[in-house]
């Protein structure tokens, strides 16, 4: 499956979007940091097949989506650069949907890739658990913004493997 | 790869100001941290302050409030030093330092060569 | 403002030799420490951070270790090359503070 030439352009508006977001000094932050131990070892390629990646990246920007689309979040972010960001999430996710749909028929069931999945979906729950422990403060939400320019950054490193691949 | 390259020595007079400029190649300019950081002759180093050229605010150390001023231009990738009313003792050389992209600013990955700032009657 | 303290102020070491340096936190800094090293004239350069993690390209003879108050930096075996003055860092909060520096000099 071919993801269009859109798609890496999308994924750099989206970490553009995200670096926009910022509504405080990370410098003022600093004791804020978290560790949401990003499960990296499901962005590590060796032995992926290529359904699975996408399996997985799709989760990661459903779970971006929906992280971003709280109530809470639209309280604390600017909501035209949200919803923005969620024109270029839903193309990621119409992109990659269309390229699971080529592949299933290659590969089996995503079932087979419900570790991942989970890992994916348990790192979101950290995060989610976290914003709320903190009140969702603006410092919360700060480091939960460079966390997602993190791990966004890194997914968009998988497809660009993905893509040398073909 | 990435590099940052800062402006020429300069010998400045007591009471006068003075402005490093830090210009940036590799990575995305707007997305990460920009700090500056000075050591004096023989002396150790110390942090003045930093900036994230897309959110634009600058945090400084409380010691050069008011007298120092960290700016960046998107446009041409540098960020820039101004540090007011010099005295002898500002002597020394002035680093810019970049941190990671997309990280929290709390570690310096890559340096600039430094720019000797000479403050002398 | 997170005070940094170093020591020794300066060592004398002959190559092969295991060297150890210390930085003390006037609180706790968790792991948000970093180490740097400098050599004269030029600018410093990243060896550890988050306490004990190498930064990329940084041979592993040198190694961190430590946590809350506490730091060390250790040479396990001390090359022509790493003869230079080191500096920790904490990046617990701001304003980010550095050691007043470890001189490793040649014995």
């Known amino acids: 499956c071919d993801l269009p030439q859109t798609h890496s352009l999308g994924n750099r508006r989206a970490l553009i979007l995200l670096a926009q977001m910022r509504r405080i000094s990370p410098f003022s932050c600093l004791k804020d940091r978290h560790d949401f131990e990003f499960p990296q070892e499901e962005f590590d390629d060796k032995q992926f097949q290529k359904a699975q990646a996408i399996s997985v990246l799709h989760e990661m920007i459903q779970q971006t989506f929906n992280l971003f689309s709280t109530k809470d979040s639209s309280a604390a972010l600017d909501e035209t650069l949200l919803d923005e960001f969620y024109i270029e999430l839903d193309q990621q996710l119409n992109d990659l949907e269309s390229c699971v749909m080529q592949e299933v028929g290659v590969i089996e069931s995503p079932l087979m890739y419900e570790d991942s999945i989970l890992a994916v979906r348990k790192y979101f729950q950290r995060i989610t658990l976290y914003l709320t422990e903190k009140k969702y403060s603006s410092c919360a939400w700060e480091v939960v913004r460079a966390e997602i320019m993190r791990s966004f950054s890194l997914s968009i490193n998988l497809q660009k493997r993905l893509k040398s691949k073909e | 790869q990435v590099q940052l390259v800062q402006s020429g020595a300069e010998v400045k007079k007591p009471g006068s100001s003075v402005k490093v400029s830090c210009k940036a190649s590799?990575?995305?300019?707007?997305?990460?941290?920009i700090s500056w950081v000075r050591q004096a002759p023989g002396q150790g180093l110390e942090w003045m302050g930093g900036?994230?050229?897309?959110?634009?605010?600058?945090n400084y150390a409380q010691k050069f409030q008011g007298r120092v001023t960290i700016t960046a231009d998107e446009s041409t990738s540098t960020a820039y030093m101004e540090l007011s009313s010099l005295r002898s003792e500002d002597t020394a050389v002035y680093y810019c330092?970049?941190?990671?992209?997309?990280?929290?600013?709390?570690?310096?990955?890559?340096w600039g060569q430094g720019t000797l700032v000479t403050v002398s009657s | 403002d997170i005070q940094m303290t170093q020591s020794p102020s300066s060592l004398s070491a002959s190559v092969g030799d295991r060297v150890t340096i210390t930085c003390r936190a006037s609180?706790?800094?968790?792991?948000?420490l970093n180490w740097y090293q400098q050599k004269p004239g030029k600018a410093p350069k990243l060896l550890i951070y988050?306490?004990?993690s190498l930064q990329s390209g940084v041979p592993s003879r040198f190694s961190g270790s430590g946590s809350g108050t506490d730091f060390t930096l250790t040479i396990s075996s001390l090359q022509p090359e790493d003869f230079a003055t080191y500096y920790c860092q904490q990046s617990y909060s701001t304003p980010l503070t550095f050691g007043q520096g470890t001189k490793v000099e040649i014995k």
């Open positions: 988050f306490a004990s």
């Open positions: 330092a970049r941190h990671l992209e997309y990280a929290f600013p709390d570690k310096f990955d890559y």
């Open positions: 590799g990575g995305t300019f707007s997305s990460y941290a």
């Open positions: 609180q706790s800094i968790s792991s948000y």
């Open positions: 900036i994230i050229p897309i959110f634009g605010t600058a």
